[in-house]
Every structure is written in structure tokens, then in C-alpha cells.
Amino acid sequence: QAGPLPKPTLWAEPGSVISWGNSVTIWCQGTLEAREYRLDKEESPAPWDRQNPLEPKNKARFSIPSMTEDYAGRYRCYYRSPVGWSQPSDPLELVMTGAYSKPTLSALPSPLVTSGKSVTLLCQSRSPMDTFLLIKERAAHPLLHLRSEHGAQQHQAEFPMSPVTSVHGGTYRCFSSHGFSHYLLSHPSDPLELIVSGSLEDPRPSPTRSVSTAAGPEDQPLMPTGSVPHSGLRRHWE
């Protein structure tokens, strides 16, 4: 008796964080023996979609011509070979941006900061939200997020950084979201350029943490359970 079929690989192009209205293609790659590919979406009762394999049969394409709220969510895929169905793929978390109006991102006291000093990035939304995300472009792990306790709605989130080093310099954006769907984000804020001057090449810092803050160094992003999917955002913004 052969062991279980190897699980397929699932990914999205151009990425798994997609702006409203844009197209995205989900790919599922199995083996050359695949007869059929099936894509399941969490909380969808029937198989979400099914497709013949593309030659040479080791993968299938699931096209989404225009991203909407309905497509945001968690997917897995399977393939069927002559001996049966494979194990499920690792999940793909498809996130849609543009669900809410863009927040405003600012730096206090200023986006020009001297190395060794403190700065707080402030993400503010017009309507109350319960999750705020801070993205740093071209960082290895750009996602930092703050989620208000007990689902309390608030208009802003603070991301303190102290002490600041040259590592903190760069371009940031933030998003806001409602906790009822971790897969729907606001439009991105306008970019904020954080400029660090007078660099003292000190060791990588640990940011200040308070009860209301979840922010970590770039190689140790904090991702509390139930947060906005990490993998999707990281893949998109790297």
C-alpha cells in the first residue's frame, strides 16, 4: 500500500494581496499523474472550483478576473490521481485591499529622526476600526500590526520605535481593517518616508512595547493568533 499522495503547492500571481478590481490567478501544482484539480475555500460547502490539469498535467489555473470581497479568504487545493485524492495543500490566504477608505500615516514628532531617539508612527482612520497594519517596503518581514483588545473600535493605532537606528529608515504604509474579516483591508495610506540621520551603528534594537502596541524588529514580526494573514502580506510586499 503506497503512502498518501504528496500535497500540492498553492500560490497566487501576482501575489496574494490584491487590490479591489484587479485580476489574480491561483495556481495549484501537483504531479504529472493528476487527473483533476480542486480548489476549496474555507466555509464554502461545495468544491470552490475544479479544473482539468494544464499540460503536462502537473498544475491547474484558477482565474479571478476581478478581485472582490467574495474572493478574499483562505484556500486549499487538492489533485486527484489514478490512486485517489492528494493531501490538501498548505493554505493560501487571499487578501483584498480597497475594502475601506485609506487611513492616514504620520510620524510623531517628525519623519526626520535622529538615530538613538524615539519616533511613533501613527495610523489614523476616519471610521473606527479594530486592526491596523504597518507595512515597510522591501523589508524581510514587513508586517507589524496592532489589534485593539476585546474588539474595541478605535480611530488610530500607534507604532512606537525606540531607539531608532538606520534599520528603521524607509518607506512605510498602513492599512486598517475590521476583525470580522482578516482578509479585507483598507486602501493603503499614502507612503511615509522615515529618514534617520546621524546613524550610530548600534546593535539591532528591540522596539518599545506597551499594552496597546504590537511592533517588532523586522526579523521578528509579532503575529498574534487571529491576526491578518502574515504570509499573504509578506509575499506581496517583499
Epitope: 487527473r35 483533476e36 464554502s44 460547502p45 461545495a46 468544491p47 470552490w48 472550483d49 486527484r80
Partner: antibody, heavy 120, light 107 residues
Framework: QVQLVQSGAEVKKPGASVKVSCKAS????????MHWVRQAPGQGLEWIGE????????NYNEKFKSRATLTVDKSTSTAYMELSSLRSEDTAVYYC?????????????WGQGTTVTVSS | DIQMTQSPSSLSASVGDRVTITCRAS??????LNWYQQKPGKAPKLLIY???RLHSGVPSRFSGSGSGTDYTFTISSLQPEDIATYYC?????????FGQGTRLEIK
Amino acid sequence: QVQLVQSGAEVKKPGASVKVSCKASGYTFTSYWMHWVRQAPGQGLEWIGEINPSNGRTNYNEKFKSRATLTVDKSTSTAYMELSSLRSEDTAVYYCARDRYDEGNAMDYWGQGTTVTVSS
Amino acid sequence: DIQMTQSPSSLSASVGDRVTITCRASQDITNYLNWYQQKPGKAPKLLIYYTSRLHSGVPSRFSGSGSGTDYTFTISSLQPEDIATYYCQQGDTLPRTFGQGTRLEIK
């Protein structure tokens, strides 16, 4: 019990379109794909396509891809098949059939059929 | 597309006879083979799915077997109510395709 009830017979002119409905009851409509199959007089069965009622995803027989459109109305548990640019060869009985998604990919319950006659 | 070829295209048998219909696929369909019964003026009814599994409510005189490209449908003891046309259908790949049908009549 599972029931698929289709709309009544239609007579259409060549070049026109027809829209056939299939109202489902006795099961959760969004939990099963729906197929459409046709049968010309005295002929065999020909698969047109399938639709997932929960999200509107479709797969078509290439032969019908440019002319057939499958849709659903979840609020009324109804599936629709529209065929455009009708020609005399489209004269047939059109069936909806529920997918039994497990081994076999079979069609386990069928509507009673809708006769579409294309004649000038 | 996978072509499904049924044989014979028609057959005549007596009540109580054992009746066999075969279906050949143009490529391996991995047991994703289903059989339907259609009576005149009626919609098809599923009898057997996945080569040999009986659909609910279907009498046990109906059975199926086969693998790869060759499949067989059998009625162990023909009854008058079995007069119909029988179709095989592959569910292995899209598009789904049917055999051309076998018309069964009583001698």
C-alpha cells in the same frame, strides 16, 4: 426530497436567445454544482457545462463556450442556462442535473427537461 | 475530449435474461464511469456511479464493473420495467462526455 423543476417549453426563431430555469428544492442549493445537458431529438446526451451556485464559478464544453451562459439566483435557489444565436440544430430537450461530488463526478438528480424548438 | 463508445447500440432480450452493455473510453478514466437509465419522454436517472456503486434506491439487479478504459453494465435478470436507453458517462475530466446510448427492448 431533492427536486429540480424546469421552466416550460419554448419556441424560438433562429438568431434569438433562450433562457431556461431550474428551481431546486429539498437540499442546500449552494452545496452542489449544477450541470446542464441537452438531448436533440432521437440523439444522445451532450454536456453543456456546470456552475457552482455558491460562487458562480463555471466550466463549459468548448462547443458551447461562446453561446451558453450559466447563472444562478441564490435567493430563489434557481439555476439558469441561456443559449444565444440559436440555430435549428439547437432544437433539443435541455436538462439541469445536480452534481454528486464524490467518486465518479456523476449527476444524481435531474430536472424534467425543457423542450426548446428553434424554427423560422 | 474523451470519447465514450457504447456497444451494442441496441439489443433485444427476454424477461429474466442477463443483459450486458459495454462502454469503452478513448483513454483511462480511472473508474470515473457512471451509468444512467432513460425511459422515453423522461429525464435520465443515475443508476451506478464510480464504476460499481449503486445509487440510492436502485435495485440490486443492476451492477457495474471495469477499470482503465473498459467498463461493463449488467442487469442480472431483466424486468419489463427495465426497457429504456442506457448511457455511460465519464467524470474523469472536463468536458463530461456520454456514450451514444444502448437501446434495450424486450423480445
